[in-house]
């Protein structure tokens, strides 16, 4: 912390400008009025202050606003935002999407920092839900944002917000997250026609149940292998060879390359070998002809 000393004669800052870059830390502390700084925060962003000088400016704002900065200051923090700790940010009440965008812009190109995560958390909690505009903004800056949320947090996403989600936003989502998102997507896109619907729903299919996959197989969707490989294993297993063939269309040939990987491997083990042979792909590992398949899970349910 900079010790308190009187400002030298003639050095009192009348405005926040480039003349301050050659002030020592103690001079900034002594000669820059915190209230002036607060009203001219937008100027700080254009001045090449050193990281030490930015520390002093932050300290001045902390003294002026011990309970947390007002949004009028937060919106113009610029690079000073990178100096904030999560503890600082927890004191803020950020309600404007413009403020959120301004601060995310400062961190653009970097990984999501603890500061940014705290800021987003404060913002979303303040809004009560992840509305479309917020989700749009967050995924634009952090494509992986959606997949960083817990299934519980995702449950607060309204179906209308799903329209803002791009395929790359779901790249790192695990099945538990897709289980929550898929029904919302299904609801959001329900009024679209077949081919358009499939284009939109495709990224969410890792959360789809068997009956929805069966329904899709009747619509000539030609699902690609990458999408098929992301489907829930328990949803794929009950599909018949004919259904998988319809679901994949011309992409069915790709099953051969994936026969040792889930869910294809597990699905093959559940199919009759003579049914697999109808595909003409040389898939091996199905149930030999003449064998009886007992569904023990069904038996347990009945007993």
């Amino acid at each position: 912390e900079v010790e308190k000393t009187a400002c030298p004669s003639g050095k009192k800052a009348r405005e926040i400008d480039e003349s301050l870059i050659f002030y020592k830390k103690w001079e900034l502390e002594a000669c820059v009025d915190a209230a002036l700084l607060a009203t001219q925060m937008d100027r700080v962003n254009a001045i090449p202050f050193t990281y030490e000088q930015l520390d002093v400016l932050k300290h001045k704002l902390d003294e002026l606003y011990p309970q947390g900065y007002p949004e009028s200051v937060i919106q113009h923090l610029g690079y000073l935002f990178l100096k904030m700790s999560p503890e600082d940010i927890r004191k803020w009440n950020v309600t404007s999407l413009e403020t959120l965008k301004a601060l995310l812009e400062v961190n653009k190109g970097h990984e999501m920092s603890p500061q940014v995560a705290t800021l987003i958390d404060r913002f979303v909690k303040g809004r009560g839900q992840l509305d479309k505009d917020t989700l749009d903004t967050l995924t634009a800056f952090y494509p992986g944002y959606l997949c960083s949320l817990s299934p519980e947090e995702l449950s607060s996403v309204p179906p209308s917000s799903i329209w803002a989600v791009r395929p790359q936003d779901l790249d790192t989502c695990d099945p538990r997250q897709l289980d929550v998102l898929y029904p919302k997507a299904r609801l959001a896109f329900q009024n679209m026609n077949g081919s358009e619907y499939f284009v939109k729903i495709q990224s969410f299919l890792g959360g789809a149940p068997t009956e929805d996959l069966k329904a899709l197989s009747q619509q000539n969707v030609s699902m690609d292998l990458a999408t098929f490989m992301k489907l829930r294993t328990d949803a794929v297993l009950p599909l018949t060879v004919a259904e998988v063939q319809k679901l994949l269309g011309p992409h069915v040939e790709g099953l051969k390359a994936e026969e040792r990987h889930r869910p294809v491997r597990d699905w093959i083990l559940r199919q009759r070998q003579d049914d697999l042979d109808t595909l003409g792909l040389g898939l091996q590992g199905g149930i030999p002809n003449g064998y009886l398949v007992l569904d023990l899970s069904m038996q347990e349910a009945l007993s």
Epitope: P8, G10, F22, K24, N45, I47, P48, T50, Y51
Partner: antibody
């Protein structure tokens, strides 16, 4: 140890532009501001401006405003100084110089780049 | 901008003698730095913040002053000290340097 290595000598025609680079090593590039200082043959030192490598913010000597542009590439720890509309009086050795802790002068300098402006 | 005037322009002394170089500012300055430059070399920081010795600089160099008048003193000249010396104000934008004092062997 701290090192600032500058690009080689340049010969330019009046009206042209020159871009001099300064590659930093031996310290955290984004922690210190980088300044540019020039020295005409047999003359004194003249401060041209400063860039914050972390944010890319700059401050230029009014004398060069509109002609000088300082940029940086954090991926290669390099700062650049571009001077446009060159005239014969811009013939000088151009130095990059690292600012030190709390404005304690320029403790580290590049080796200098001679820019000759001649028709 | 703050104009720095160094005096004398040239100082002729012998090794072992004491050298006193002056730098006068056109308006009050918070801090002054001093640099040494030899032909074909980049400047080298000697004194920062008016009176602090830069890293690796011999103790025979010292700085003093305040306001508009600053001094660099070399207590006993060594052969390697003969060079050009520049003052630089660190107070006002733009930074400015003096025109230099050439210290030559008598």
């Amino acid at each position: 140890q701290v090192q600032l290595v500058q690009s080689g000598a340049e010969v330019k025609k009046p009206g042209a532009s020159v871009k001099v680079s300064c590659k930093a090593s031996g310290y955290t590039f984004t922690d210190y501001n980088m300044n540019w200082v020039r020295q005409a043959p047999g003359q004194g030192l003249e401060w041209m401006g400063v860039i914050n490598p972390n944010y890319g913010t700059t401050s230029y000597n009014q004398k060069f405003k509109g002609r000088v542009t300082m940029t940086r590439d954090t991926s290669t720890s390099t700062v650049y100084m571009e001077l446009s509309s060159l005239r014969s009086e811009d013939t000088a050795v151009y130095y990059c110089a690292r600012g030190d802790y709390d404005g304690a002068g320029f403790a580290y300098w590049g080796q200098g780049t001679l820019v000759t402006v001649s028709s | 901008e703050i104009v720095l005037t160094q005096s004398p322009a040239t100082l002729s002394l012998s090794p072992g003698e004491r050298a006193t170089l002056s730098c006068s500012a056109s308006s009050s300055v918070s801090y002054m730095h001093w640099y040494q430059q030899k032909p074909g070399q980049a400047p080298r920081l000697l004194i920062y913040d008016t009176s602090k010795l830069a890293s690796g600089i011999p103790a025979r160099f010292s700085g003093s002053g305040s306001g508009t008048d600053f001094t660099l003193t070399i207590s006993s000249l060594e052969p390697e000290d003969f060079a050009v010396y520049y003052c630089q104000q660190w107070s006002s934008n733009p930074l400015t340097f003096g025109q230099g004092t050439k210290l030559e062997i008598k």
